[in-house]
Interface confidence: medium
């Protein structure tokens, strides 16, 4: 092909090229064909005769103002045609005659201000009608029943002000599962109009200036329809009273999507009407008071998103939102609950009673005042499910004996990002008989008891990442009740002593992280005692991240027992030379981290073992040697080998001797070294 | 208000020890951790450690540890910076420093505290 | 330890114009802990920016921080007087903290 687009099954991209015309020398079996961002201004149908398998043509972001009839023609099996971003702005009734076999057609961003005549009548097969961000100032799409398939018509961002019954009947054979009307200037919803439509299962009227009276005339056109999705995103709903929603009463809504409203007064039974609500979006927006009897009715909601729903109005404490005791005592389905991001001033003792059903409850970044967890905070949710609580950025500096006591369901618990600051007794979790998980990374300090984890021996993921851990190397370890444990993460605390029965026991690890810490004094020989050996036993470890640690020195027994070990992240350490043997016992290892240490040498008795059935190597920025005896062997294998080694060429370069230095350590000629045989395997 | 007050500056001969003090007021000694920063002339900031004055517990840069020596008394509200064996590489200026939240960023600094090493 | 480098070394503008000084560390900083601190000749420190794009009590709307990952802004978006000095970036993500080198913003 003597145009640049590229050609792989069946699909040819022509994209961005600058092409003026159509290609007409590509694989005449093409199926798939984008042509979008060149500076077509017209698509001859002649040129596409060759193409006649086409099942999808995108000629988006182009100059084209006439579409000719005859391409459909030669186009029989086409079922997605995007004209997005071109410069139509008439349509006739030929321009898609032929077009019989659409399923898609994308309109969007061109110039058409009307619709004259039928131009649709054809496309009996059309599922989705994309004419949104030209000029329409009706949704008048023809004059006789037609589109019987349609399932989608998008009209966002148009000048559309009224919508009509005789202008939306042509789609009284239609079941309408998207009415897109976004982003226009609708002032009126004249009676019927929304039942001139065979069937309107979702309406979607975000950025619409609709306020709470004409919201209100909406929902009674909605009544006796089929909506189950009704979308009213920023349409200036600033308050909502117990009519507001009345029409939906005879409607089986599932989905209501009241975000970005400003919405600052929701009236007691404001949603009464709504038995069968399942989906509730509420986020962002400006409530000042939830009223006890606001969330009434909403017997059937399972997810609840009241993210950024509750801001304070100044800096003044007057100012703070509130949120009546039992609340959402009415909310009896209600599985998922976000309430991050908001002003809440604290939890109160019924804040969240009646909860029956909840699994999931997101309060991160959710309260202005919550610095102390007591036995009290979570009293509301004794008789909840709670499967993930989430606590997250919430300036909590204490957790009191028993705060989750309540929460015997709880299986992920989420303290990370907080300022707690404080010695763990090990009664903070009592109660916790079914967790799998704590997050406490990124708090202020942790100082450990041999009883910490005492009360939790179910847990499998343990979190402490940067909480300055205190008294890790405490003998009995605090660690030694957590048999089931298979996550440790230990990381960025500049750890300086552990002891060696740190992990006994803990034989069920599977991953460990203890980067970013100061552990090279353990492994010295010189260590007072000698080192210590802190990985034994772990003979289910799958990876182990031993990054910036400053070690200088490895034990040659060190990984002995981990035999399951699949990554071993070793970088930015000052290690130069390796035991023989170290990593004989690694049969799984699958990737090797070395990068930024001091490494000259790379040889078989040290690496053989490690490299054999790896498919991932890091050895970026190091000093290699490339003399014979330290990287002849290391040199063959990298020829050989199909294991990835990223950067292979720019980053693996060689430090001595001097006329070597910077040279590619993959181009160090190995054929005048003794004993450079084939690389053996 | 809030604030620490460092020490006099000093000058001392290399191998001498030296300790300097800084002391909390305004505010609850123990609630905040507090971190020592170097500044050699002419040069930028280097974060040497932090202690917890409520029970003393210590963190140290792994390019300060076994250098200096940081510990605090609680009961006068004070944090102590410490050397055994001064070296004239140790001339610098030193700030005690609060640190604030999570730990980490310093919302409150002494003064500083001069030291000079010099034969 | 995590390096932080910061770029330019001077930046050499006049009163009222825009600031915009860059801080990239060497690893990737997944959660946030980024402050930026003011410092003028003979005095200590000053906190601006923690968290990567908070403002801290007391320090004018001007000052303004962004970024994440490696790479972190602090834009001054119209220069007065009393801000030229050295500004210095800080990482707490590890609790090894380290200091950028500093930028030095000076009277052109």
């Known amino acids: 092909s003597t145009t640049k687009c590229t050609v792989s099954h069946e699909v040819a991209d022509c994209s961005h090229l600058k092409l003026t015309q159509v290609p007409d020398d590509l694989p005449t079996n093409i199926t798939v064909l984008n042509l979008t961002h060149n500076q077509l201004r017209r698509l001859p149908a002649a040129n596409f005769t060759r193409y006649s398998q086409l099942t999808s043509l995108d000629v988006g972001f182009n100059t084209i103002s006439k579409l000719e009839p005859e391409l459909c023609q030669k186009l029989p099996m086409l079922k997605v045609l995007n004209l997005q971003h071109n410069e139509l702005s008439q349509l006739s009734d030929k321009t898609f005659a032929f077009c019989t076999n659409l399923t898609e057609l994308h309109l969007m961003s061109n110039s058409i201000q009307k619709i004259k005549n039928n131009p649709f009548v054809k496309q009996k097969n059309l599922i989705t009608l994309d004419l949104s961000h030209n000029g329409l100032s009706s949704t008048k799409l023809g004059t006789q029943v037609q589109l019987e398939n349609l399932q989608e018509l998008l009209l966002s961002n148009n000048k559309i002000q009224a919508l009509k019954s005789e202008e939306l009947d042509i789609f009284a054979n239609s079941s309408l599962k998207k009415l897109e009307l976004s982003s226009n200037q609708i002032k009126e919803f004249s009676p019927g109009c929304f039942h001139a439509i065979g069937r309107l299962f979702g309406l979607f009227l975000n950025n619409v200036q609709l306020g709470p009276s004409l919201t209100e005339k909406l929902c009674l056109e909605l009544a006796n329809t089929s909506i189950r999705n009704l979308s009213l995103s920023n349409s200036q709903l600033s308050t909502t009273s117990n009519t507001t929603f009345l029409g939906l009463k005879w409607t089986n809504l599932t989905m209501l999507d009241l975000s970005y409203n400003n919405l600052n007064v929701v009236g007691n039974d404001s949603f009464a009407w709504l038995p069968q609500l399942e989906y509730f979006f509420l986020e962002y927006n400006n409530i000042q008071h939830l009223f006890s009897h606001s969330l009434h009715g909403l017997f059937n909601v399972r997810y609840l998103n009241l993210k950024r729903s509750f801001t304070k109005q100044s800096i003044s404490l007057a100012s703070l939102p509130k949120i009546d005791d039992f609340s959402f005592q009415w909310l009896k389905c209600l599985e998922h609950l976000n309430m991050e991001d908001n002003d809440i001033p604290g939890i109160k003792s019924n804040m969240f009673t009646g909860l029956i059903n909840l699994k999931y409850l997101s309060l991160s970044n959710s309260f202005t005042s919550l610095r102390t967890l007591t036995n009290e905070t979570f009293v509301s949710l004794a008789h909840s499910p709670l499967h993930i609580l989430n606590l997250t950025k919430n300036k909590i500096s204490k957790i009191e004996s028993d705060a989750f006591s309540w929460l015997g369901h709880l299986e992920v618990l989420d303290l990370g990002l907080n300022e707690i600051g404080q010695e763990l007794t090990g009664q903070e979790w009592r109660g916790l008989e079914n967790i799998f998980e704590i997050y406490l990374s990124y708090n202020k300090y942790l100082q450990l008891t041999r009883n910490s984890f005492a009360l939790v021996p179910s847990l499998q993921r343990l979190m402490l990442r940067r909480v300055a851990l205190k008294n890790v190397d405490s003998s009995p370890s605090p660690f030694q009740p957590l048999r089931n444990l298979t996550i440790l993460d230990l990381s960025n605390n500049n750890i300086a002593n552990i002891n060696d029965d740190m992990l006994e026991g803990l034989e069920k690890l599977e991953i460990l992280d203890l980067q970013h810490n100061n552990l090279a004094r353990l492994w010295k020989h010189a260590n007072p005692g000698g080192p210590i050996y802190f990985l034994k036993g772990l003979s289910h470890l799958h990876i182990l991240n031993l990054e910036s640690n400053g070690f200088d020195e490895i034990p040659v027994e060190v990984f002995k027992d981990l035999f399951e070990l699949k990554i071993i992240d070793l970088g930015l350490n000052n290690l130069n030379t390796l035991p023989a043997s170290v990593f004989n016992n690694q049969v799984s290892l699958k990737s090797l981290n070395l990068q930024k240490n001091l490494i000259t040498s790379v040889e078989k008795k040290v690496f053989g073992p490690a490299f054999r059935n790896l498919t991932e190597l890091d050895m970026r920025f190091n000093p290699f040697d490339c003399t014979c005896e330290s990287i002849a062997w290391f040199v063959n294998w990298i020829n050989e080998t199909h294991t990835n080694i990223p950067e292979l060429s720019s980053h693996y370069l060689c430090n001595t001797p001097p006329h070597y230095h910077g040279f590619p350590v993959r181009l160090f000629d190995t054929s005048s070294c003794k004993d450079s045989a084939p690389f053996e395997l | 208000g809030v604030e620490l007050v460092q020490s006099g500056a000093e000058v001392k001969k290399p191998g001498e020890s030296l300790k300097i003090s800084c002391k909390g007021s305004?505010?609850?000694?123990?609630?905040?951790?507090i971190s020592w920063v170097r500044q050699a002339p002419g040069k930028g900031l280097e974060w040497m450690g932090v202690i917890d004055p409520s029970d003393s517990y210590t963190n140290y840069a792994p390019s300060f540890q076994g250098q200096v020596t940081i510990s605090a008394d609680k009961s006068i509200s004070t944090a102590y910076l410490q050397w055994s064996s001064l070296k004239a590489s140790d001339t610098a200026m030193y700030y005690c420093a609060r640190e604030w939240g999570i730990g980490g960023m310093v919302d409150i600094w002494g003064q500083g505290t001069l030291v000079t090493v010099s034969s | 330890d995590i390096v932080l480098t910061q770029s330019p070394a001077t930046l050499s503008l006049s009163p009222g114009e825009r600031a915009t000084l860059s801080c990239r560390a060497s690893?990737?900083?997944?959660?946030?802990?980024l402050a930026w601190y003011q410092q003028k000749p003979g005095q200590a420190p000053r906190l601006l920016i923690y968290d990567a794009s908070s403002r801290a009590t007391g320090v004018p709307a001007r000052f303004s921080g962004s970024g994440s990952g490696t790479d972190f802004t602090l834009t001054i978006s119209s220069l007065e007087p009393e801000d030229f000095a050295v500004y210095y970036c800080q990482q707490y993500y590890s609790l090894s903290i380290t200091f950028g080198q500093g930028t030095k913003v000076e009277i052109k």
């Open positions: 690893q990737y900083i997944d959660i946030s802990y």
């Open positions: 305004g505010y609850s000694f123990t609630d905040n951790w």
